[in-house]
Interface confidence: medium
Amino acid sequence: APLATELRCQCLQTLQGIHLKNIQSVKVKSPGPHCAQTEVIATLKNGQKACLNPASPMVKKIIEKMLKNGKSN
């Protein structure tokens, strides 16, 4: 079963990357009692959300850039 149905995780699957121009903001959720894994959730400019793989080099670069632009929390 997807992890979201076992804990209270929001990311059932993750994307390895996404084009920076499509991202409005990024949220990084640390592990906790609600979810045992780090979760990276991007809010896209079309209003949708997408989970990104925190271990992906491309995602790490996205997080760095969003932090510099003040669009990450």
């Epitope: 149905t5 209270r8 995780c9 059932l12 009692p33 949708q48 989970c51």
Partner: antibody, heavy 125, light 107 residues
């Protein structure tokens, strides 16, 4: 029609026990997390407990931890709340709620989108 | 635990008014916040999910905004059926917590 129906409430003495049930219909019960939420007379909403779809993960408010146990029987489409060592402050209407997850691309969230009608629990001598 | 604080606790308004209810979290919860409406003797009803998304079947006069720690529920052009108690709820982490509620009364 998606429906939740609670039962099992009533009057119980302090220190006593009660088991609440919530019968679900109209959706695939085993796929979704469920919660219990209570409301003391004239007060606001207080989350009590939650359980994952498989029953493998459970969560409790500090106020009930060690006294209440949430469980589910997916073969019967039923959610339970076993309440032990009841106190006067546990007096409330108890609601079960479905935590309907919405799935956008690679994203899931939890909202209590369907509620039962509530079952009253009174703890008094 | 994350504390949720709503203001005001009660509010008097007239049909046709525009009202705003605020909810503040004790720490950042991103947009992991919902709004519920409850009428006396009834179960709560989901209005807004993820801070700003209207639940299916909810009239468009309801809207939500905010992110981080500060959130707002706005009702444009109040209707008689809108007089009720409103609650915010965070699901960023367990334990899940609700605001204390805002009772909207007829002036």
């Amino acid at each position: 029609e998606v429906q939740l129906l609670e039962s099992g409430g009533g009057l119980v003495q302090p220190g006593g026990s009660l088991r609440l049930s919530c019968a679900a219909s109209g959706f695939t019960f085993s796929e979704l997390s469920m919660s219990w939420v209570r409301q003391a007379p004239g007060k606001g909403l207080e989350w009590v407990s939650a359980i994952s779809g498989s029953g493998g993960s459970t969560y409790y408010a500090d106020s009930v931890k060690g006294r209440f146990t949430i469980s589910r029987d997916n073969s019967k489409n039923t959610l339970y709340l076993q309440m032990n060592s009841l106190r006067a402050e546990d007096t409330a209407v108890y609601y079960c709620a479905r935590e309907g997850g919405r799935l956008e691309p690679y994203y899931y969230y939890y909202a209590m989108d369907v509620w039962g009608q509530g079952t009253p629990v009174t703890v008094s001598s | 635990d994350i504390q949720m604080t709503q203001s005001p606790s009660s509010l008097s308004a007239s049909v046709g008014d525009r009202v705003t209810i605020t909810c503040r979290a004790s720490q950042s919860i991103s947009d992991n916040l919902h709004w519920y409406q409850q009428k006396p003797g009834k179960a709560p009803k989901l209005l807004i999910y993820d801070a700003s998304n209207l639940e299916s079947g909810v009239p468009s006069r309801f809207s939500g905004s905010g992110s981080g720690t500060d959130f707002t529920l706005t009702i444009n052009s109040l209707q008689p059926e809108d007089f009720a108690t409103y609650y915010c709820q965070q699901y960023y982490s367990t334990p899940l917590t609700f605001g204390q509620g805002t009772k909207l009364e007829i002036k």
